[in-house]
Amino acid sequence: YHGCPSECTCSRASQVECTGARIVAVPTPLPWNAMSLQILNTHITELNESPFLNISALIALRIEKNELSRITPGAFRNLGSLRYLSLANNKLQVLPIGLFQGLDSLESLLLSSNQLLQIQPAHFSQCSNLKELQLHGNHLEYIPDGAFDHLVGLTKLNLGKNSLTHISPRVFQHLGNLQVLRLYENRLTDIPMGTFDGLVNLQELALQQNQIGLLSPGLFHNNHNLQRLYLSNNHISQLPPSVFMQLPQLNRLTLFGNSLKELSPGIFGPMPNLRELWLYDNHISSLPDNVFSNLRQLQVLILSRNQISFISPGAFNGLTELRELSLHTNALQDLDGNVFRMLANLQNISLQNNRLRQLPGNIFANVNGLMAIQLQNNQLENLPLGIFDHLGKLCELRLYDNPWRCDSDILPLRNWLLLNQPRLGTDTVPVCFSPANVRGQSLIIINVNVAVPSVHVPEVPSYPETPWYPDTPSYPDTTSVSSTTELTSPVEDYTDLTTIQVTDDRSVWGMTQAQSG
């Protein structure tokens, strides 16, 4: 194998791998025909002048996970065929100017997970064929203008997990071929207008986990090919009305963990490929008409953990494909009867941890495919007659932690619940809050005549699906359920329809049952 160092393994196809803590310098002699060299997990601390001089055919060089902290400017001399160079996971703080000079074929340069403090235009000025540059996980505080000006063929640039506080609007201006730009986990507070204007081929932009407060109105207007836009966990307080108008290819958009207070109608411009929109952990207080009307293919809308107290009746217009709507942990007190009318394909709605006092009888009128409804931990005292009657696919209904008023008016609901107990789950059942003498007792088994002995309970029709089931033997037997089979058979049809089984979020938030419902 043309002389393989003892501490390395060499294959007859010119592959050399040198690993182990006993290696403290680049092993020699390296086989002259080596095309791939990997130096991994060693105790090498520096690269001196031209350690690879005799292996000019080298195509790939990986020097990773070492103690490397110093490199001589001529370390990579004579490696004109090198296409891939990784110096990731070392302890580099400084890159000497001219280090990459002569690497005319270099396409991938990985400098991630080091301790680099700065980069300069001269560092990459010779790397005109570079397609991928990984700089994430360093200590960069700023990028000087011109740093990437010669990298016109660059398609992927990762600057994530650094300490960048600002970005010059000119720093990316020559990167017309860039497809992926990652700036996540920095300290950016704003992005100047025009910063991304030259990135006409950009498909992924990762800006999550910064401190961005404002987005310029036209920030993404030249990025028509953008498909993934990550903006979560910033300090964004408002979205300019046109900021997302020119993003027809977008299929992933994250905005959770910001400070958004309001959303203007049509803010989400036509995005026919967007399936999920996560807006949880913001400060949204109301939803106006048509705010999501352009999102025709949206299937999941997460609006939980906001401060929503008002939803306009037409807020969800256009969401004909929506299957899951999460509104839990907000400040809702009332809902318009037509608010969900357009959501014909809705299967799961989360309304727990709000302040709902009542629900309109037609609230679920057009949402016939509902499988799961979360209503726990609200202020509900009763529910309208027949509210769930048409929901033949309903297999999960959570009603606990509400102040149910167990007077005679509760009978229709109680009877329906009695027949549909499996839908309520086994963890927690709804209990009476009033009158005081039945407080804490299960709503399902409570004897209403005990609760309110002075009130005569008239024989009224109940939820049409189920017969009225009185407590006292003075009522005719014909109104009682004839057999347990009749009681359970409709329910058995639903127990297998657990297409969506929403997990209880209490564990995620570390809340007790009393806190969260």
Epitope: S108, E132, T155, K156, N158, G160, Q179, V180, R182, Y184, N201, Q203, E204, A206, Q208, N225, Q227, R228, Y230, S232, N251, R252, T254, N273, R275, E276, Q299, V300, R323, E324, Q347, N348, T499, I500, Q501, V502, T503
Partner: antibody, heavy 122, light 107 residues
């Protein structure tokens, strides 16, 4: 350890129905997208469907749209594929896989089951 | 839908050889591409994600490169356990299509 186990594969006649199950263990099932992929005998891999972590979002390949339904039960750590109007060309090994993705560029089916054979023949 | 083509469809190589497999997308998919290895009778195994990132536990002899429409999987030194079929897959948009596969067998 992290594991996916498919079941439910069988011999079925054209036009028939079948329900495949995939039992997950060793990871927090409700945190992950899940997917079904199939492989006809001697052929390549074909993505057929995936489902979001909560079950809200779903997508299908055109070849199965309207005939197959993907679903999940997070309480039971289970993924399902309800197949109806089966055709001879649906004959394949069906794999379930965990679809792992994040906002730092990770995208991949990183955990696979062993597969279950579905044969559609008269 | 995005169509992935792989070349070659099959190749014969010896232990120690350097092997290169190409995957081309019908339209740009940035770096949303993964590579899998499948052995007969077994489920596929993820090797590379994000076009060039090595999945945890995968030997460092595997590497990926490329973005946009042209991608490459390289096995720096073929080992006996590397004889298998290799598939690329795109995650840029639905449906998440696979390439037709490249079979690597013993010369």
């Amino acid at each position: 350890q992290v594991q996916l186990v498919e079941s439910g594969g069988d011999l079925v006649t054209p036009g028939g129905s079948l329900r495949l199950s995939c039992a997950a263990s060793g990871f927090t099932f409700s945190d992950y997208y899940m997917t079904w992929i199939r492989q006809a005998p001697g052929k390549g891999l074909e993505w057929i469907s995936d489902i979001g972590s909560s079950g809200g979002s779903v997508d299908y390949a055109d070849s199965v749209k309207g005939r197959f339904t993907i679903s999940r039960d997070n309480a039971k750590n289970s993924l399902y594929l309800q197949m109806s109007s089966l055709r001879a060309e649906d004959t394949a090994v069906y794999y379930c896989a965990r679809y792992n993705w994040n906002d730092r560029g990770y995208d991949g089916f990183d955990i696979w089951g062993q597969g279950t054979m579905v044969t559609v023949s008269s | 839908e995005i169509v992935l083509t792989q070349s070659p469809s099959s190749l014969s190589a010896s232990v120690g050889d350097r092997v290169t497999i190409k995957c081309r997308a019908s339209q740009g998919i940035s770096s949303a591409l993964a590579w899998y290895q499948q052995k007969p009778g077994k489920a596929p195994k993820l090797l590379i994600y994000d076009a060039s990132s090595l999945e945890s536990g995968v030997p460092s002899g595997f590497s990926g490169s490329g973005s946009g429409t042209d991608f490459t999987l390289t096995i720096s030194s073929l080992q006996p356990e590397d004889f298998a079929t290799y598939y690329c897959q795109q995650f840029n948009s639905y449906p998440h299509t696979f390439g037709p596969g490249t079979k690597v067998d013993i010369k």
